[in-house]
């Protein structure tokens, strides 16, 4: 603790100029004071001034008023500093002395004589209010006041609490009257060294080094650090914890960059056609009548369906078509004839049969010819009779289908199973695909036919097909293939368009 006992001398009266021994001072009592402050004693005794002592210069002669003086010699109030916990009780001895010698340092002069003394014993609390008193004896009167205050930076009832206001990284506070800390705005904690972060800043995921700040820890973002950061490269996905990549609906792959719902995201099919998804970035447009092209973007000619009969020529119009009929025919599609068999209307050896009592006719065409007047040569490939991508070829009166590998039959309708030969080694599962068989290998094997035994690095054997990227340590199978567009499967071995029930990983 640390404080100051202050004694303010106000007035001393010694009208007769007498000493304590009854003698008078010549020419007058040149008066100075000795003050002794010590611990409380019921009976004041001689001995050391345990709380301090102080002397004044000569303050006046006989009777005088003592003025306040803040510095230098003769300072008033008198200061008795202490550096212990103030006990709340004290004993004070004030002695008035006459000196024949030096005004400034009467203590050192020989022949000093006591004029009077007073003793005060009691309790005194620390505070700014002065306690005023007056003591009389037969010859003298002394008016004075006193108090105990704490030294700078000391606080509390006994001046025992040290507190120094500060505003640095070890504390941001001022001191209360009792010595407790009062944090500056924006700071908290026992020593006011903890900043109060931006309101709402996430307790675990954010922190601050100064008030109203919110700095995010790794993996978190946003004004309040309450939004996780998804895996770097995550395109169409979100996270609930940092570095996750949970795909949005319609997206797949490690980075949610494979479009499983191209139709919805891109609307590639035009002119009211129907879009069907078929794997990552795969889709098919089914055109409405009158449209063609990959995206049904091409409008068909209104004449494309050959609506004009009997050799009529078709002309496209804005929203329709018009048939120009040959001589002897009329009607919207030149379907009505003004000819009879007498006009020999049947071409290419067709035989004419009269109808409606000779007012019209019908032609019976020889093989390889067709049309109302047998005017058209039959193209047996127009009906697209070949399935599974087979090519149709006209061969005289008949046609043949040239099948793609893996298919057979008159119309290429029969599928040749590549799996019948059991091409997959080590218990691999075989799947018939358009381009041949594909094997799904058991754990520990890889290769197109499961012929490669995996040893240490699961990606070293190149288990991913079709240019896929291999990652290890991401799944129980030791590797994961990130498929390029157009392929799926645990090894990206399946082109888009597999049966939907087939399992795959991406």
């Amino acid at each position: 603790g640390s404080g100051i006992f202050q004694l303010r001398l106000q007035e001393f009266v010694n009208q007769r100029g007498m000493l304590a021994n009854g003698q008078s001072c010549e020419p007058g009592c040149r008066t100075f004071f000795r003050i002794c402050l010590k611990h409380f004693q019921a009976t004041f005794s001689e001995g050391p001034c345990t709380f301090g002592n102080v002397s004044t210069p000569v303050l006046g002669t006989n009777s005088f008023v003592v003025r306040d003086k803040n510095s230098g010699s003769g300072r008033n109030p008198l200061q008795l500093p202490f550096n212990f916990t103030w006990p709340g009780t004290f004993s004070l001895n004030i002695q008035a002395w006459h000196t024949p010698g030096d005004d400034l340092r009467p203590e050192t002069s020989p022949g000093n004589s006591l004029i009077s003394q007073i003793i005060i014993q009691g309790s005194l609390a620390v505070g700014k209010i002065w306690r005023t008193d007056e003591q009389n004896d037969t010859l003298t009167r002394l008016s004075y006041s006193y108090r105990v205050i704490c030294s700078d930076n000391y606080y509390g009832e006994s001046c025992s609490r040290l507190c120094k206001k500060r505003d640095d990284h070890f504390g941001h506070y001022e001191c209360q009257p009792d010595g407790s800390l009062s944090c500056l705005p924006g700071w908290t904690g026992k020593y006011c060294d903890q900043p109060i972060c931006l309101s709402g800043c996430h307790e675990q995921n954010g922190y601050c080094s100064k008030p109203d700040e919110c700095i995010c820890r790794p993996g978190w973002q946003g004004r309040l650090c309450n939004e996780c950061i998804p895996h770097n490269g995550c395109r169409h996905g979100t996270c609930s914890i940092p570095w996750q990549c949970a795909c949005d609906e319609g997206w797949g792959g490690l980075f949610c960059d494979q479009d499983l719902n191209y139709c919805t995201h891109h609307s590639p099919c035009k002119n009211g056609s129907t879009c069907s998804n078929s794997g990552p970035k795969g889709y098919t447009c089914t055109c409405l009548p009158g449209y063609t092209g990959e995206h049904c973007e091409l409008g068909l000619s209104k004449c494309a369906s050959n609506p004009c009969r009997n050799g009529g020529s078709c002309k496209d119009q804005e929203n329709s078509y018009h048939c120009l009929c040959p001589p002897g025919y009329y009607g919207q599609h030149c379907e009505h004839s003004t000819l009879t068999c007498a006009d020999s209307p049947c071409f290419n050896g067709g035989s004419c049969r009269e109808r409606n009592q000779g007012s019209s006719y019908a032609c019976e065409c020889p093989p390889n010819f067709t049309g109302s007047n047998c005017e058209k040569k039959v193209d047996r490939c127009t009906s697209n009779p070949c399935a599974n991508g087979g090519q149709c070829q006209n061969r005289g009166p008949s046609r043949t289908c040239r099948c793609r590998p893996g298919f057979t039959g008159t119309h290429c309708e029969l599928h040749i199973s590549d799996c019948a030969r059991s091409p997959c080694a080590h218990g691999g599962t075989c799947h018939d695909l358009e381009n041949g068989p594909v094997c799904t290998c058991p754990a520990g094997f890889s290769g197109r036919r499961c012929e490669v035994r995996i040893t240490h690095d699961a990606c070293a054997s190149g288990p991913c097909f079709n240019g896929a990227t291999c990652y290890t340590g991401l799944s129980p199978n030791n590797f994961v293939c990130n498929c390029p567009y157009g392929f799926v499967g645990s090894r990206c071995e399946f082109p888009v368009g597999l049966p939907p029930s087939f399992p795959w990983v991406a």
Partner: antibody
């Protein structure tokens, strides 16, 4: 018992840089009660405070060295670091790391053994 | 910049009292710490918060701080107290050390 161990000292060319490490054991660098400081002492001279860091990464530097100094922390390694660039002969000193305690009003109660950095060609 | 001034050296006889001063503008309004450093060793904190001793520091070390001066007092000085002593305070966010005082125990 808390221990601080410096490493990374040695001979450095003038104009070069140094990176010193201070490994803390026996206590967590992430405690809210401490700052972690670097102090240096040139041969035969007094102590000079370089700067300090809190576990969150807040840093404070001696204004006279601020332009050349970076202090960083790695809580996962319970270590903090001093990077100093554009070194000159007068940077030759023993470099100490120390723990500054908020409760001790910034007094440094634990010090490392020091690592000597000599800047010379 | 803030400076702390110490006498370069203080000599004391064994068993006597050594007082080391540390002066700085309004130093009494800051908390002073004192460090002891023996040759070839790291500094050791002997006084913090003006007058408090860390555990393990002998009672003969005491400190005070008011006005512009902090004082480290070693009463009953022993030969083992011969060392360099540094005062330290914080000026805003910067640590400041005094220049150091070499205490020599005579005899």
């Amino acid at each position: 018992e808390v221990q601080l161990v410096e490493s990374g000292g040695g001979l450095v060319q003038p104009g070069g840089s140094l990176r010193l490490s201070c490994a803390v054991s026996g206590g967590s660098i992430s405690s809210s009660s401490y700052y972690w400081g670097w102090i240096r002492q040139a041969p035969g001279k007094g102590l000079e405070w370089i700067g300090d860091i809190y576990y969150t990464g807040s840093t404070y530097y001696n204004p006279s060295l601020k332009s050349r100094v970076t202090i960083s922390v790695d809580t996962s390694k319970n270590s903090f670091y001093l990077q100093m660039n554009s070194l000159r002969a007068e940077d030759t000193a023993v470099y100490y790391c120390a723990r500054e305690d908020v409760i001790l009003r910034g007094g440094s109660d634990y010090w490392g053994q020091g690592t000597l950095v000599t800047v010379s060609s | 910049s803030y400076e702390l001034t110490q006498p370069p050296s203080v000599s004391v006889s064994p068993g006597q009292t050594a007082s080391i001063t540390c002066s700085g503008q309004r130093l009494g309004d800051k908390y002073a710490s004192w460090y002891q450093q023996k040759p070839g060793q790291s500094p050791v904190l002997v006084i913090y918060e003006d007058s408090k001793r860390p555990s393990g520091i002998p009672e003969r070390f005491s400190g005070s701080n008011s006005g512009d001066t902090a004082t480290l007092t070693i009463s009953g000085t022993q030969p083992m107290d011969e060392a360099d002593y540094y005062c330290q305070a914080w000026d805003r966010d910067t640590g400041v050390f005094g220049y150091g005082t070499r205490v020599t125990v005579l005899g």
